[in-house]
């Protein structure tokens, strides 16, 4: 165990070396619109060489009884943008609304501002100035001034105008210690509301150009986010640009511009009132055709809360989703806790897996409606990412046992042929080929959304004989003490290297 | 056309215990955040409880304890499970639900109201 633990280091170590260096990127600080021109961006793109080099490497492989015992078919992921040719203008003081279906690109848009995201074509201008306020509330360890001003140089006005227009005087006032009472370890716990609004007062406190809020009104009561949409956004930040990420009407009226983000394009981008116009067309395009349709409510949060957990592209950093982070983009909360990540890796959640057997395999199946998230090892089926799972479909999956088990164990029991009964025993067969497509089913009475965005072209098979002992020592992990996460790349990485 | 229609209020002595229901009916889509406001007579209207979808819960300080706020997804209804009245829990609930009607795409959503129901406890 010891030994792979090590060669894992030392791959990562190595890839981490390997990796192109981070180009800062350079802006003109006397910008005063944002303006983005034709920009296409793509997630994980070394993703696609990995898949280029399994290509190759099993174009003519087959197992030694002529049989796939582990292939993978319609492999279509490669040259998918997550943003497509997007255009947009604003200048100095107007207020963006960007909306959009469940991974639309919503996210994406703003990170590709950030410069988190690079752009494979376009051209994005604005002054770098920026200023970000995440879904997800996070509290560093500290008073609620620290957790504000956050390492700005302190301005008494304008701190008593961001506390006010966030929400924060009554609660503040509560308190025996005022702003110093201290939160995090040690200290006081807060409501969901409360963590939203300091950490929205802490984006907002910062000076910059372009104000960047992702959906920062989620877990806001509506009387409360009427009142700071008005007081801050609209009135304190009257004289700054700013991209706001909603889903809601009110402030798409409110908005100077609206972009629809649908599928990674622009649908629409103008005024409200060309959207009031458009808004027939809008239904009777998308009414019982696209994918976003079939989806819950839930769903409407960002595909990319990977770049907010920052993983690596093997994704395999050990992370506690109950500690408090210090950096700015591994940010849970109370409510960002239950949420089940099924969107660590963007690259993984953009296929839908499906299992079809030559003969009836045992396994514990998928826990899915338990309270706390268990930490993603390897998973066949994607979440629905807010705590209600996409589960199999009956006609894709015939398995007799009912879907109960550790999602991760069950993974491992299912590429193994392993019966978990309180302990791991292990049965060698030939007779199952588990096929796994990544290509969207046709008899799937819901299209996943993200399987609609990829293109169905190219076709990718690899068939490999597996070492079960060697896969069994990859995978083998302390449910309990080992938080890590081990991504389908680092498998799909372990059977290319590992030959038998 | 989307209406909420709340029921379960009257008039309870202090220290007993109500159940509010808040159903939403007509062409819904799906719903994000719903939840329980009140305003006293002479008050301004406060947040009791709110839920989202998925479950996540915040009261008001005041409620801390007491209430408990579920939902059924299925059913597009929200409870509020009212525990430990007190005479100053008297006043006109109300039901809020952020609804994407059928007609909107994208998940767009409007806020949507109840028309409220009296709750009074007395001492």
């Known amino acids: 165990q010891t030994w792979y633990d090590s060669l894992g280091a030392i791959n990562k170590i190595q890839d981490f070396l390997q990796k192109q260096e981070y180009k800062t990127l350079e802006y003109n600080l006397t910008t005063t619109e944002v303006v983005m021109e034709n920009v296409t961006a793509f997630w994980e793109e070394g993703f696609g060489e990995l898949f280029e080099k399994a290509k190759q490497n099993n174009n003519n492989r087959k197992t030694s009884n002529g049989d796939d015992s582990l292939f993978f078919s319609n492999f279509s992921l490669l040259g998918t943008p997550v943003l497509k040719d997007i255009n947009f203008k604003i200048e100095r003081g107007q207020l963006l609304a960007v909306a959009g279906s469940t991974g639309a690109g919503k996210t994406s848009l703003l990170m590709v501002i950030m410069g988190e995201l690079e752009p494979s074509e376009g051209k994005i201008k604005h002054s770098g100035r920026i200023s970000f306020c995440s879904q997800f509330s996070w509290i560093m360890p500290g008073t609620i001034k620290e957790n504000i001003i956050f390492g700005v140089s302190y301005d008494e006005y304008r701190y008593r105008s961001v506390i006010k227009a966030c929400q924060l005087e009554e609660d503040i006032s509560k308190f025996a210690e005022k702003d110093n009472i201290v939160l995090g370890e040690g200290g006081i716990t807060l409501s969901g509301g409360q963590r939203a609004r300091i950490s929205l007062a802490r984006a907002v406190y910062k000076d910059a150009d372009l104000y960047l809020l992702d959906s920062p009104f989620g877990y806001l009561d509506v009387l409360t986010e009427k009142e700071i949409f008005e007081s801050c956004v609209c009135k304190l930040m009257a004289n700054k640009t700013r991209i706001l990420v909603t889903s809601k009407m009110e402030h798409l009226k409110k908005a100077d511009k609206i972009l629809i983000l649908h599928e990674g394009s622009s649908y629409f981008y103008g005024t409200f009132s060309e959207l009031q116009n458009l808004q027939p067309d809008f239904s009777s395009k998308l009414m019982g055709c696209d994918s976003f349709d079939q989806f819950s409510a839930e769903r409407r949060n960002s595909i990319l809360t990977e770049t907010l957990h920052r993983f690596s592209l093997e994704g395999d950093a050990p992370v506690s989703w109950t500690e408090t982070k210090k950096q700015s983009f591994k940010q849970t909360g109370e409510f960002g806790e239950k949420r089940k990540n099924s969107i660590l890796n963007p690259i993984n959640s953009i296929r839908k897996f499906s299992i079809v057997q030559k003969t009836p395999l045992q396994m514990n199946g998928i826990e899915e409606d338990s309270d706390e998230p268990l930490e993603r090892r390897l998973s066949l089926v994607p979440d629905s990412e807010q705590g209600e799972a996409i589960l199999p479909r009956i006609s894709v999956i015939s398995t007799g046992p009912t879907l109960q088990a550790r999602r991760r164990q069950s993974v491992l029991n299912l590429m193994t042929h392993s019966v978990n009964q309180g302990q791991n025993i292990h049965r060698k067969t030939t007779a199952s080929t588990r096929k796994v497509s990544l290509a969207p089913q046709a008899n799937l009475t819901e299209l996943d959304i993200y399987s609609r965005r990829l293109s169905q072209e190219t076709g990718l098979e690899i068939s490999e004989e597996i070492n079960e002992e060697d896969l069994k020592e990859c995978f083998f992990d302390d449910m309990e003490s080992i938080p890590a996460v081990t991504t389908w790349n680092t498998y799909l990485r372990y059977i290319t290297v590992h030959k038998s | 056309q989307v209406q909420l229609q709340e029921s379960g209020g009257g008039l309870v002595q202090a220290g007993s215990s109500l159940r509010l229901a808040c159903a939403a009916t007509?062409?819904?889509?799906?719903?994000?955040?719903m939840g329980w406001y009140r305003q006293a007579p002479g008050k301004q209207r406060g947040m009791v409880a709110i839920?989202?979808?998925?479950?996540?819960?915040d009261y008001a300080d005041s409620v801390k304890g007491r209430f408990t706020i579920s939902r059924d997804n299925a059913k597009n209804t929200v409870y509020l499970q009212m525990n430990s009245l007190k005479p100053e829990d008297t006043a006109t609930y109300y039901c809020?639900?952020?609804?994407?009607?059928?007609?909107?795409?994208?998940?767009?959503?409007?806020?949507?109201w109840g028309q409220g129901t009296q709750v009074t406890v007395s001492s």
């Open positions: 007509g062409s819904i889509r799906s719903i994000n955040n």
């Open positions: 809020h639900a952020e609804i994407t009607e059928q007609s909107r795409p994208f998940y767009l959503t409007d806020d949507y």
């Open positions: 839920i989202t979808r998925v479950g996540n819960t």
